[in-house]
């Protein structure tokens, strides 16, 4: 299936040019998406090209500027947030990144009624997190690991927590491991629907071992970065959930929400919090051995001023074949009765599907079914449920949006997106207004991305929000590579792959092959999305064939494939890449003397193991910021898939699956090892240990470090990195510069 054909014809061949590395590094062919900032059923905010904040009313067709670019510029604001009562706007400036999601910033409150900034009782700086209440204009914020509440923006703050301490106690914000591996947010506080209560997590990292690394900076002495970071088997953070009444927070004080007894009996995690009503909250907990999850629905008891979580409202989700959930345990979407909910989990056939839970999980009603997976529930209204899946035409790497009518019986299903722009759009996400009155569809490909606005009742397209016309025009004279998504059937395993082919691809010729791999559990690389990136350049200009393969352990194709890697990371992911390469060679257009593999992070681990597999298939390869031993990586992530590194659990495989154990096997390949020295995620330690093992084995290799760079290798390092890797590959493939 050719998804993105090259527009090359003989008549225009002389005007067409290949992609250059410079194009990629400059982001010349990047695309835009449009996500409305919904503020009601029919209104949204959007930051215009000239940085005005504009309010759009879909029904009247009117728009007006609520905040001028002049006001934004006066405090160098890069972000904003309108209070639900529309009286105030917070303006965010001095953005300072911390980890993947977290950052600090300075906040100013602008009063829309008088056109002035709120003076007196200004917010402290820098703030770690700030948000409006869902109703009115109360503010909750986190400063120096403590939570504060303002009843009104001009009021003095009330301090809710007092024990916050850097790297020790975190209130309302996650510590490193919860941010990266559990919550995937910068915040750990949640307002109830009408703002009566504020729930928050407290993370106690007092006993967690600390990772320390040098940050070289410009000073005479480097400074040391210390992060409480639990590696596999280490002591974990202790989490507690509290709820405070925000009307009179100084009266009762924070109330702790009890942990289900079956969870509290051993090490556990808190995984998410979902408010149902102002007086009902749903908490999800997970055992440290992550195959048991408990969803607990708790009710506020006015007479006792406590949160009661009866055992009858505990719902257990257990996996007998792997870990609970996909990457994360799914979150519930509650229905209007405020007790029953919809949730995605594995059905009896091992496919993740939507289930409706009214009383017990055992009596759950399955809403979707088939040999495909439901991926996300976007919205439940009184008569419809909107979700995404990869059902359409049996392509796991697609995403379409569906509507199920839950108001009628039997429920009817309609694909909202399948036939909208079939060639251009096969991978969608959606954003819904209140009550799903309207929604935006964002199509990511395989064609040029497009964002559209739709009527939530009729699904009719109202207008195009962003169609990337400039990008389309810019690409008209570019020789883009061809892309195809197909599958290999090998020993009862389906291996989907994406192949990126040079513009004038000729099956009768031989091409160098580069495998790009990630391969981490519950990941997916073979997706029908648009991208003009480094590998596009390698195919377009350098004539390489690039392939991405989703092997065992990857997502959205059922539990058999997903959980195949459970407790044995580093085995089947590598085997499946090798199997695919052998199949590609059989296709006849691959030069088997010029095959390389590269990957980043988990992909760096897989590429390293593939290079050291002793197959002789790979001439060379690159590992960027690889994991080298699972004992070095975060507990929450690692133990989910590997269990504990203890003798009575899975220590043996922890030891067997290291890159270092295979040092000897790198002798016959060209290996480029790359890592940032300030990588807070996959620590430089990983590459340091690979390098040490290779030196000890007297194996030659190439290496590059990026001083003071984290796991993303951003900024100028990106340019240097891709230039360096390009030289390495061209040299490996004997391509002239």
């Amino acid at each position: 299936i050719v998804l993105r054909p090259s527009r090359v014809h003989n008549s225009e061949e002389n005007t067409m040019r290949a992609l250059t590395l410079k194009d990629i590094l400059n982001g010349t062919f990047s695309y835009k998406t449009f996500f409305p900032n919904w503020i009601s059923g029919q209104e949204y905010l959007h930051q215009s090209a000239d940085n005005n904040i504009v309010l759009y009313n879909i029904e009247t067709g009117q728009s007006y500027t609520i905040l001028s670019n002049r006001t934004m510029k006066s405090v160098n604001a890069s972000n904003y947030g309108l209070s639900p009562d529309r009286q105030f706007v917070y303006l965010e400036s001095d953005y300072s990144k911390l980890w993947r999601y977290s950052y600090t910033a300075t906040y100013y409150i602008y009063d829309l009624s008088n056109g002035e900034f709120v003076r007196g009782n200004e917010l402290p700086r820098p703030i770690q997190y700030l948000c409006w209440s869902p109703v009115g204009s109360k503010l909750a914020y986190v400063y120096q690991n403590n939570i504060y509440l303002k009843q009104r923006p001009g009021d003095p703050p009330f301090q809710i927590t007092f024990n916050g301490r850097e790297n020790k106690i975190f209130n309302g914000i996650p510590d490193w491991v919860y941010e990266e591996e559990m919550l995937a947010t910068k915040y750990a506080l949640w307002w109830s629907p009408n703002g009566k209560f504020l729930a928050y997590a407290e993370f106690n990292d007092t006993d967690i071992p600390v990772i320390a690394y040098s940050y070289y900076g410009d000073e005479q002495y480097p400074r040391t970065i210390n992060i409480p970071y639990p590696k596999a088997g280490a002591k974990n953070p202790v989490v507690r959930i509290f709820i405070i009444d925000t009307t009179y927070p100084a009266y009762v004080g924070p109330q702790e929400v009890p942990v289900p007894a079956m969870i509290a009996s051993s090490d556990y995690y808190f995984s998410w919090l979902t408010w149902v009503t102002d007086e009902r909250v749903c908490l999800q907990w997970l055992k440290r051995v992550q195959n048991v999850s408990v969803l607990s629905i708790c009710d506020f008891r006015e007479d006792w001023q406590t949160w009661d979580c009866p055992k009858t409202q505990e719902h257990i989700e257990e996996s007998r074949t792997g870990w609970a959930g996909g990457f994360f345990v799914s979150t519930p979407v509650f229905s209007y009765d405020a007790i029953s909910y919809y949730k995605i989990f594995s059905d009896k056939d091992g496919y993740k599907h939507i289930h409706y839970i009214k009383d017990t999980v055992e009596n759950a009603i399955q809403i979707t079914s088939g040999k495909w997976e439901a991926i996300n529930i976007f919205r439940v209204t009184q008569d419809s449920l909107f979700y995404s899946s990869n059902e359409f035409e049996e392509y796991p790497g697609r995403r379409n949006i569906y509507r199920i009518s839950i108001g009628s019986y039997p429920p009817s299903k309609k694909c909202v997106t399948c036939h909208l722009r079939k060639e251009r759009c096969q991978y969608y996400t959606a954003s819904f207004s209140d009550y799903a009155k309207y929604y935006a569809l964002v199509c990511y490909g395989p064609g040029i991305p497009i964002s559209t606005l739709h009527d939530g009742r009729t699904d009719q397209e109202i207008k195009i929000l962003e169609e990337n016309k400039e990008l389309e025009n810019a690409l008209k004279n570019i020789q883009l590579p061809k892309e195809e998504i197909k599958k290999l059937e090998v020993d009862e395993i389906t291996l989907w792959y994406k192949m990126i082919l040079p513009p004038q691809f000729d099956r009768s010729k031989k091409y160098p092959l580069l495998i790009q791999v990630y391969g981490g559990p519950c990941s997916q690389s073979v997706r029908s999305v648009f991208a003009v990136n480094w590998i596009s350049y390698l195919a377009s200009k350098e004539g390489m064939v690039i392939a991405l393969v989703d092997g065992r352990g990857t997502a959205f194709q059922g539990d058999k494939l997903l959980y195949a890697v459970y407790r044995k990371l580093g085995v089947y992911e590598v085997e499946d890449q090798i199997t695919a390469v052998r199949k590609f060679i059989e296709m006849g257009f691959i030069d088997e003397k010029r095959i390389a593999i590269w990957g980043w992070s988990y992909g760096g681990y897989v590429s390293s193991l593939a290079l050291a597999s002793g197959t002789g298939l790979f001439k060379c390869g690159i590992a960027v910021a690889p994991v080298s031993s699972w004992e070095y990586y975060a507990s929450v992530y690692t133990e989910r898939f590997m269990g504990l590194p203890t003798k009575d659990d899975n220590l043996e495989h922890y030891k067997n699956s290291t890159v270092m154990a295979r040092a000897e096997y790198f002798r016959n390949v060209d290996y480029l090892l790359i890592h940032g020295t300030a990588d807070d995620n996959v620590h430089f330690q990983n590459s340091a240990q690979i390098a040490k093992a290779l030196v000890n084995a007297q194996v030659d290799f190439q290496a590059m470090w990026y001083s003071d760079q984290n796991h993303g290798l951003s900024g100028l390092s990106t340019n240097h990195l891709y230039t360096h890797m390009t030289h390495f590959l061209k040299q490996c493939f004997s391509l002239s510069d």
Epitope: R152, F158, F162, Y248, A250, V252, G253
Partner: antibody
């Protein structure tokens, strides 16, 4: 009906110790933060200390920090104030009150602590 | 810490008269955290008003509270004989919670 009953007051020498108790009834004791407030003879009210419902968090006025310890036994519905290194200026009627920082909606009748040699 | 200054120190009024008690804070206090108490000789304080203007359970409607920021007022619309006592304002916006020095309402 909410009731708070303090006990344990008395005469003590400077440097001495005393432990005050406050027996609570008529409400779910473990749910509420509780405080101690004192009143020196003929003077106004002064907040001394507070404790969260679970007992996990405690708060003190600077004047008593390091000398006084607030605690609670939720199984006995009782609040305590352990007072060490007592000084003459600690002489006061000590009230236990229901509430964290404000409002204090119920108060005990108070117990008199006299620090004198 | 926030210092609360009450005025007047003593208010001499007759039953049936209107009493206006003032409480001024050294720095801004959110009205949610301002309370008024009544204390009679030999008795424990009693909560009258919380959240600057909400009457506590069982408090007659002749007692009312108002104000915001740094200036708060307790008003007794018509003094009854049992209202002659000492009145304290209190803030819990900032640790430590603090009380005013009190206003004594005495019979003229």
């Amino acid at each position: 009906e909410v009731q708070l009953l303090e006990s344990g007051g008395g005469l003590v020498q400077p440097g001495g110790s005393l432990r005050l108790s406050c027996a609570a009834s008529g409400f779910t004791f473990s749910s509420y933060a509780m405080s101690w407030v004192r009143q020196a003879p003929g003077k106004g009210l002064e907040w001394v200390s507070a404790i969260s419902g679970s007992g996990g968090s405690t708060y003190y006025a600077d004047s008593v920090k390091g000398r006084f310890t607030i605690s609670r036994d939720n199984s006995k519905n009782t609040l305590y104030l352990q007072m060490n290194s007592l000084r003459a200026e600690d002489t006061a009627v000590y009230y236990c009150a229901k509430g964290w920082f404000t409002p204090f909606d119920y108060w005990g009748q108070g117990t008199l602590v006299t620090v004198s040699s | 810490e926030i210092v609360l200054t009450q005025s007047p120190g003593t208010l001499s009024l007759s039953p049936g008269e209107r009493a206006t008690l003032s409480c001024r804070a050294s720095q801004s206090v959110s009205s949610s955290y301002l309370a008024w108490y009544q204390q009679k000789p030999g008795q424990a304080p009693r909560l009258l008003i919380y959240g600057a203007s909400s009457r506590a359970t069982g408090i007659p409607d002749r007692f009312s509270g108002s104000g915001s920021g740094t200036d708060f007022t307790l008003t007794i619309s018509r003094l009854e004989p049992e209202d002659f006592a000492v009145y304290y304002c209190q803030q819990g916006n900032q640790i430590p919670p603090t009380f005013g020095q009190g206003t004594k309402v005495e019979i003229k």
